[in-house]
Amino acid sequence: EVEKTACPSGKKAREIDESLIFYKKWELEACVDAALLATQMDRVNAIPFTYEQLDVLKHKLDELYPQGYPESVIQHLGYLFLKMSPEDIRKWNVTSLETLKALLEVNKGHEMSPQVATLIDRFVKGRGQLDKDTLDTLTAFYPGYLCSLSPEELSSVPPSSIWAVRPQDLDTCDPRQLDVLYPKARLAFQNMNGSEYFVKIQSFLGGAPTEDLKALSQQNVSMDLATFMKLRTDAVLPLTVAEVQKLLGPHVEGLKAEERHRPVRDWILRQRQDDLDTLGLGLQG
């Protein structure tokens, strides 16, 4: 808390400008009107305030808006956003994607902080679902964002948003998350032709059931080993040697290098040795 003291004569701030960097903390508290600060928030970022001075400015805004800042102020917070706590952010009602982008920009290059996580949560909950534009924005700043969501949160992603997902956005997703995303992707890409469909669906196949893999094996898709290794164990086990051979095409030779790893190891174990021998790879069931 900054002690309440009268503003010295001639020091009352008429606008937010660089002269304020020479003000002591108590002078900022006494001489800067909170309403003026709120209307000129866009200027704060251009001024090299110290962390201590920013604390004073935040305190003034907190007093002016005890129920939470309006979006007009939030959009121009800039580096002052880094001073906010998750508790502060929970009071906000952020509806504009531009506001979200502006605040994410401040944190760019850093890992997702608790503040950013709270901001995103507030924003997405306010929208009711993860629409395509939001997903585009979030994955641009945080490629791992999608995989940081719980299966329950992912269920609010509409199939139309799946078009915004890039393969690298799914790199850290676990099976439970892909179980939720795969049916949405299947729906989103259902009108595409065979080869184009496979290109789009490929990164979601970690959630595919056996019957879909069997269907793909009939389409000469030549799945690469990296994709095959991400398939669900329970989806892979029922596939026959012939089906896996068709699914992988020329990549089937890669099974040898992965024979000690899941799910290839589990699949090999459950095949008849005679069938495995037809591959000519020396796999031992």
Epitope: D174, M229, L237, R262, L269, G285
Partner: antibody
Framework: QVQLQESGPGLVKPSETLSLTCTVS??????????WSWIRQPPGKGLEWIGY???????NYNPSLKSRVTISVDTSKNQFSLKLSSVTAADTAVYYC???????????WGQGTMVTVSS | DIQMTQSPSSLSASVGDRVTITCRAS??????VNWYQQKPGKAPKLLIY???SLQSGVPSRFSGSGSGTDFTLTISSLQPEDFATYYC?????????FGGGTKVEIK
Amino acid sequence: QVQLQESGPGLVKPSETLSLTCTVSGGSVSSYYSTWSWIRQPPGKGLEWIGYIYYSGSTNYNPSLKSRVTISVDTSKNQFSLKLSSVTAADTAVYYCAREDALTGFDIWGQGTMVTVSS
Amino acid sequence: DIQMTQSPSSLSASVGDRVTITCRASQSSRYYVNWYQQKPGKAPKLLIYAASSLQSGVPSRFSGSGSGTDFTLTISSLQPEDFATYYCQQSYDASYTFGGGTKVEIK
């Protein structure tokens, strides 16, 4: 529900062969999704996986023990067994048999049997 | 072999505390990592499989996360029955390996 029970001698002399059997009840050793493992734990130490067997007879052993280990399965008796040759005092441990479900992990364990290697 | 390094090796905590145990694999284990709880004189019990899936019958205060080489077991609010030793285990590579264990003791 599936239960596992280890049996075998609690004392083995150095250089001899340790032999243990695990009896599966309430389920079949021929289960499609299951492999059957042996895991041991020396007194006051952590867990060490020894190896597994599938009902087809296919095995997979810990490389550090492979030269001394044999795991076998008897589907007619619903049992699987461990043989560990040329034992030393370092093989003194609680030996567990466990079921591994391919979709989860070691979800069912026996209660463990203490085997001491001493002359 | 894939080595699993658990930390800390022991910790003291109070009932109600949030407890986090980490496990680092020497090479990628994808998401094929399981967590077990063991009490003295008892066999281990499976808590979490495939890095983040809760085993049937296990209280929801237990959760797991991670993929690749870094994995975490979290107990959101420690209960008296949770004082035990916890082990991670990888099953991605055919040579299964366990972490060294983390003993959770009463503060």
